[in-house]
């Protein structure tokens, strides 16, 4: 999960035409694991915005020291500032802490820009605005980082919710909600609903901002409207998914549906962007520029470079398509679609331009590892990371940013054969080199 | 090849509008590959820029003119127009029409300008 | 607002030698950024765009150098038609908004 666009600093390839839709489905969903209803203690636990990161409150050592931590499903490991550095206002002091315990190892963790190192160990850790719970956790503290922490963004760690085949240095070390299900008696499951602001703010009104809930344990009905769907996650490393077919205002890409997840496709809250492999990236645009061809903006405002601005308040959201994603399924041959408006892929930035004006730059960017879906897709929807159950829901948030011509949309289900093909098989290559930095 | 020439009122009265043409010739005011802007020149002072055109009709504004600029295209004519409401001696300029060029992000080519004076 | 700061405002300097003209730009600016130069009583010509690429017709005397914040155009050897005005213009924030306030080139 890294920067520019990956946060915190990765700001990172057949079958009958689809659009048949079967009779929608009359019974509930099936009941997921975990408390449902309410979890009053955790909403809008989350603060920050898009472009830097989602941050939880969380409390590190005996006696506990208050961090904020960016909330990253694109790694695996919880990572904590443990020495001085310009853009960190405190960090994590293991001499202070009496339940600090050393692991005698170190960690390195090279980014394409950038990278962090630090030394492990384990201490007490709990949640704040989460379950009332303390548990014992590996720790990674950063003594050393390039290009990771962002000046500004008020977080001084990251707590990776992905797979331990991801972590670092290797699947030996126990991730953080792995080490939370196994210490305690909440289930294995948590939601995130991450909410953009949708208009730029400042950076008094950004500190300010609630960002959005992170419900450990399962999930609240309070945060979504509708229905959820689920998605199988296909392999348990980052959160992988499979993509079906991508249309833009309902335009089919027709494309080889392997292209959509060349060489995976994951959801990665850690990344600012919805970034897609080079040859979906450059349909896609193709297909929003004609799209939106009434006006026409810059090479680099499409590179995610330069800021469009219009006068405040007349965003020309009608001018931009929707962008749909369908996921493969629960049910054989069965797919559902997510659909965003350009409220959540135009990515407001503040203090560029004059108060009189609104700018964005486009948050659709180019990848070279696979689709990720980031916060752009995210802010849409309330997704829930179902691990007991290996799949991933989504539903329309209840704060996602839309006008009163369009919302954001989680619809199905629609017939979608041969959808395993979709799915692009890794070669097998010395596990040394699979892991060479998430640009 | 392609020339840009303002015309219009060198004299304009104070609380009036001011009103200026620019011609295109040797090309297309339709290309899609341009847009098309305002941009003037106090005397002795700094370039100032006043707005944007796509062929399509789409403008774009400098915020601190908004409400007294308007810029409009007639195709048919090859011509794009601004008008300015509100005038006062601190309009007095030099206004240049342009053509934003090198996708969309550079003025590459210019008219020669247009002295246009505020006063009663 | 992104603010372009040139200078120095005035440039005293014979023919022949070379002149380093600087804007900086109040936040980065990527390398969106472009060099006009202009004659009295004509219009403004593009020399520079994105940073460092000439536009057409411009002799290679000419170059633009920089990206982030700090930029400089440098003219190699001045030429007795080079001495005029020059501005400099971002692009990062689209449309193209701000002009820096202007560099003059004199005859020493």
């Known amino acids: 999960t890294h920067l520019g666009i990956r946060l915190p600093l990765r700001s990172g390839l057949a079958g009958p035409p689809l659009g048949l839709r079967l009779p929608r489905e009359t019974d509930e969903e099936s009941e997921e694991p975990g408390r449902r209803g309410s979890f009053v203690e955790m909403v809008d636990n989350l603060r920050g915005k898009s472009g830097q990161g989602y941050y939880v409150e969380m409390t590190v050592g005996s006696p506990p020291q208050t961090l904020n931590i960016l909330v990253d499903t694109g790694s695996s490991n919880f990572a904590v500032g443990a020495a001085p550095h310009p853009f960190l206002h405190r960090y994590y002091q293991r001499q202070l802490s009496s339940t600090y315990r050393d692991l005698r190892k170190g960690v390195y963790v090279p980014y394409t820009q950038g990278k962090w190192e630090g030394e492990l160990g384990t201490d007490l850790v709990s949640i704040p605005h989460g379950p009332n719970v303390t548990v014992r956790a590996n720790i990674a503290a950063i003594t050393e980082s390039d290009k990771f922490f962002i000046n500004g963004s008020n977080w001084e760690g990251i707590l990776g919710l992905a797979y331990a085949e991801i972590a670092r240095p290797d699947d030996s070390l126990e991730p953080f909600f792995d080490s939370l299900v196994k210490q305690t008696h909440i289930p294995n499951i948590f939601s995130l609903q991450l909410c953009g602001a949708g208009f730029p703010l400042n950076q008094t009104e950004a500190l300010a901002s609630v960002g959005g809930s992170m419900i450990i344990g399962g999930i609240d009905h309070s945060l979504y409207t509708g229905r959820l769907w689920y998605t199988p996650i296909r392999r348990e490393w980052y959160y992988e998914v499979i993509i079906v077919r991508v249309e833009i205002n309902g335009q089919d890409l027709k494309m080889d549906c392997k292209e959509y997840n060349y060489d995976k496709s994951i959801v990665d809250s850690g990344t600012t962007n919805l970034r897609l492999p080079k040859k979906v990236f450059e349909a896609a645009v193709k297909s929003i520029k004609a799209a939106s061809s009434t006006e026409k903006f810059p090479d680099g405002f499409w590179l995610g470079e330069q800021l469009v601005c219009w006068q405040a308040g007349t965003t020309p959201w009608n001018i931009f398509p929707v962008i749909s994603l369908y996921l493969m399924g629960e049910v054989t041959n069965q797919s559902f679609r997510i659909t965003i408006l350009p409220q959540q892929y135009l990515r407001p930035v503040e203090d560029v331009a004059t108060s009189q004006d609104d700018c964005y730059k486009f948050a659709v960017s180019q990848s070279s590892t696979g689709t990720v879906m980031g916060a752009v897709i995210m802010e849409g929807f309330y997704v829930v990371f179902d691990r007991a159950r290996k799949r991933i829901g989504f539903a329309v948030s209840a704060c996602h940013v839309h006008d009163e011509f369009r919302t954001a949309a989680v619809e199905g289900p629609f017939v979608t054969a041969d959808m395993e093909d979709c799915g692009y098989n890794i070669p097998q290559t010395d596990e040394s080199t699979l892991m060479t930095g998430r640009a | 090849q392609l020339q840009l020439q303002e015309s219009g009122p060198g004299l304009v009265k104070p609380s009036e509008t001011l009103s200026l043409t620019c011609t295109v010739s040797?090309?297309?005011?339709?290309?899609?590959?341009?847009?098309w802007g305002w941009i003037r020149q106090p005397p002795g002072k700094g370039l100032e820029w006043i707005g944007n055109?796509?062929?399509?009709?789409?403008?774009y504004y400098n915020p601190s003119l908004r409400g007294r600029v308007t810029i409009s295209v007639d195709t048919s004519k090859n011509q794009f127009s601004l008008k300015l409401s509100s005038v006062t001696a601190a309009d007095t300029a030099v206004y240049y029409c342009?053509?934003?060029?090198?996708?969309?992000?550079?003025?590459?080519?210019w008219g020669r300008g247009t002295l246009v004076t505020v006063s009663s | 607002e992104i603010v372009l700061t040139q200078s120095p405002a005035t440039l005293s300097l014979s023919p022949g030698e070379r002149a380093t003209l600087s804007c900086r730009a109040s936040q980065s600016v990527s390398s969106y950024l472009a060099w006009f130069q202009q004659k009295p009583g004509q219009a403004p010509r593009l020399l520079i765009y994105d940073a460092s690429n000439r536009a057409t017709g411009i002799p290679a005397r000419f170059s633009g150098s920089g990206s982030g914040t700090d930029f400089t155009l440098t003219i190699s050897s001045l030429e007795p038609e080079d001495f005029a005005v020059y501005y400099c213009?971002?692009?990062?924030?689209?449309?193209?908004?701000?002009f820096g306030g202007g560099t003059k080139v004199e005859i020493k």
């Open positions: 055109i796509y062929y399509s009709g789409s403008t």
């Open positions: 040797g090309g297309s005011i339709s290309s899609s590959s341009y847009y």
């Open positions: 342009a053509r934003l060029g090198h996708g969309y992000n550079y003025f590459d080519l």
């Open positions: 213009q971002q692009v990062y924030v689209w449309p193209p908004r701000t």
